[in-house]
């Protein structure tokens, strides 16, 4: 008879994670007597996958009934494939022997590649908020995919971004891979409602990419603009001064009124008005009894927003000479300074 040949007809087999892989092997002869074994890898470090002779291989089933003597099909099926199963599998015929069976002939090998889906992309933004016109970085990570080929895109409000850097690790062969990408985004005042999207396309996703999102509201801080004005009052001995705090984000805001540098009142913003762009407005007012002042009054609206250094705007409230002479008894209308406030933001 011709010498036995071990035929592995497929050079490669690709299987999706979780499925079963069938590795085909046929012999051309029954001789010599001895077991068939399947190994992953070659050489001294090869891993035994199946031994016809003995052992418990719960994930491996033989495709044919090996107890039939005329059976020459030694194909196996491996269930519940994971990326860790990737590698080259060899069907090997051994000749019965002692102290060990003797390797007689090996098949050429079948490379098993495992298609594993990438994990849902996780997008994370900067640890601290930044203000408009500044650039912030967003990272996107996904793991556990195979094969290595993968496409990652960044979008901001549907517009594709170009300023990003992507790495796929490891660089060499591996059972599965990870992707890490960092995108640089320039913030604008209108970005409170903006989103960045990391989109991943992979062969396992069948044209339906995975997306991870992050809201720029978590990354942006829009500092408020302040305007201090005086409102007309009927009572001649009272002045109503308002501080309009506009277009700020996030909500956290504390306002302090100072009269000639002395704290008059502190309040925390509560009932806010939300603008279309997601920023907030708030107004605070201060009622000043002009009779209590013999001299001009500098009123300062000081705002601490989102734990940042305070900003302030001042307003000079003039007390008329007539009121100064008669002191607090005079109930005439106080002369007001020009409507233009005193400058100052500190």
């Amino acid at each position: 008879e011709d010498e036995l040949q071990v035929i592995q007809p497929e050079k490669s087999v690709s299987v999706a994670a979780g499925e079963s892989a069938t590795l085909r092997c046929a012999m051309t002869s029954l001789i010599p007597v001895g077991p068939i074994m399947w190994f992953r890898g070659a050489g001294a470090g090869r891993e035994l996958i199946y031994n016809q002779k003995e052992g418990h291989f719960p994930r491996v089933t033989t495709v044919s009934e090996l107890t039939k003597r005329n059976n020459l099909d030694f194909s196996i099926s491996i269930s519940n494939i994971t990326p860790a199963d990737a590698g080259t599998y060899y069907c090997v015929k051994f000749r019965k022997g002692s102290p060990d069976d003797v390797e007689f002939k090996s098949g050429a090998g079948t490379e098993l590649s495992v298609r594993a889906k990438p994990s849902a992309p996780v997008v994370s933004g900067p640890a601290v908020r930044a203000t408009p016109e500044h650039t912030v970085s967003f990272t996107c990570e996904s793991h556990g995919f195979s094969p290595r080929d993968i496409t990652l895109k960044w979008f901001k409000n549907g517009n594709e971004l170009s300023d990003f850097q992507t790495n796929v690790d490891p660089a060499g062969d591996s059972v599965s891979y990870s992707i890490h990408s960092t995108a640089r985004v320039v913030l604008t005042r209108g970005d409170v409602h903006s989103q960045v999207i990391c989109e991943i396309a992979h062969i396992t996703l069948q044209g339906d990419p995975l997306r991870g999102t992050a809201n720029l509201s978590e990354a942006i801080r829009v500092p408020p603009t302040l305007e201090v004005t005086q409102q007309p009052m009927r009572a001649e001995n009272q002045a109503n001064v308002t501080c309009q705090v506009s277009n700020f984000y996030p909500r956290g805001l504390q306002l302090t009124w100072l009269e000639n540098g002395n704290v008059s009142r502190t309040e925390t913003a509560s009932t806010l008005i939300e603008n279309k762009d997601g920023t907030y407005n708030w107004m605070s007012w201060l009622l000043v009894n002009t009779c209590a002042h013999r001299d001009d009054v500098v009123l300062t609206c000081q705002v601490e927003h989102d734990g940042q250094q305070a900003v302030s705007k001042s307003y000079a409230l003039e007390i008329s000479a007539h009121q100064k002479e008669h002191g607090s008894d005079i109930t005439h209308e106080a002369a007001l300074a020009p409507t233009a406030p005193l400058g100052g933001s500190g």
């Epitope: 008879e1 029954l30 001789i31 007597v33 001895g34 077991p35 068939i36 016809q52 002779k53 003995e54 090996l66 107890t67 039939k68 003597r69 005329n70 059976n71 019965k96 022997g97 002692s98 102290p99 060990d100 069976d101």
Partner: antibody
Framework: EVQLVESGGGLVQPGGSLRLSCAAS????????MHWVRQAPGKGLEWVSA???????YYTGSVKGRFTISRENAKNSLYLQMNSLRAEDTAVYYC????????????WGQGTMVTVSS | DIQMTQSPSSLSASVGDRVTITCRAS??????LAWFQQKPGKAPKSLIY???SLHSGVPSKFSGSGSGTDFTLTISSLQPEDFATYYC?????????FGQGTKLEIK
């Protein structure tokens, strides 16, 4: 049903000859290594001879040159031609099938008695 | 030739007992060891191959172990039908050889 049935045993004088037959049913005999095993009265088992699927033959030392194992595929039968018989060849002879891949004995016939005596 | 030595040669036991028979090869036989059961006037019956694998239809009370030169056959709970002679056999290389047998008798 897989079965082996031996025949051809009997009483023979020392120096005489006998041909044992083993008819196989339920499987193709030529696809298996086949064996003859004997058991002298009140003694243990002794392997005698084997024939491989390629027609290769093997014998225990005491029968070499006197016994010949063969098979006839068309009849799905195994044979043991015994010449120059001796008193010590007296035994029950069993036809045995070797296992699928390792030649472990799995199927035994019921045996046939060979008595060598004058 | 490879010599096979069984011990004990005979063994008395009671129904329900657990018994162990040992077999030693004169040289390493890998795990190409078989066990057979034979009752008087009957052909041997194959129990175990490759030291520990049970032939089809053999009850799980029979178990085998060992590799290299030392092997054991264990019957976990003896029943009346288990009283018989047991043989080990090496089949790694020709000539295949048997142990001398262990006769298991009822006490």
């Amino acid at each position: 049903e897989v079965q082996l049935v031996e025949s051809g045993g009997g009483l023979v004088q020392p120096g005489g000859s006998l041909r044992l037959s083993c008819a196989a049913s339920g499987f193709t005999l030529s696809s298996y290594d086949m064996h003859w095993v004997r058991q002298a009265p009140g003694k243990g088992l002794e392997w005698v001879s084997a024939i491989g699927t390629a027609g290769d033959t093997y014998y225990t030392g005491s029968v070499k040159g006197r016994f010949t194992i063969s098979r006839e595929n068309a009849k799905n039968s195994l044979y043991l031609q015994m010449n120059s018989l001796r008193a010590e060849d007296t035994a029950v002879y069993y036809c045995v099938r070797g296992g699928v891949w390792d030649d472990a004995f799995d199927i035994w016939g019921q045996g046939t008695m060979v008595t060598v005596s004058s | 030739d490879i010599q096979m030595t069984q011990s004990p040669s005979s063994l008395s036991a009671s129904v329900g007992d657990r018994v162990t028979i040992t077999c030693r090869a004169s040289q390493d036989i890998n795990n190409y060891l078989a066990w057979f059961q034979q009752k008087p006037g009957k052909a041997p019956k194959s129990l175990i191959y490759t030291a520990s694998s049970l032939h089809s239809g053999v009850p799980s009370k029979f178990s085998g172990s060992g590799s290299g030169t030392d092997f054991t056959l264990t019957i976990s709970s003896l029943q009346p039908e288990d009283f018989a002679t047991y043989y080990c056999q090496q089949y790694v290389s020709y000539p295949y050889t048997f142990g001398q047998g262990t006769k298991l008798e009822i006490k």
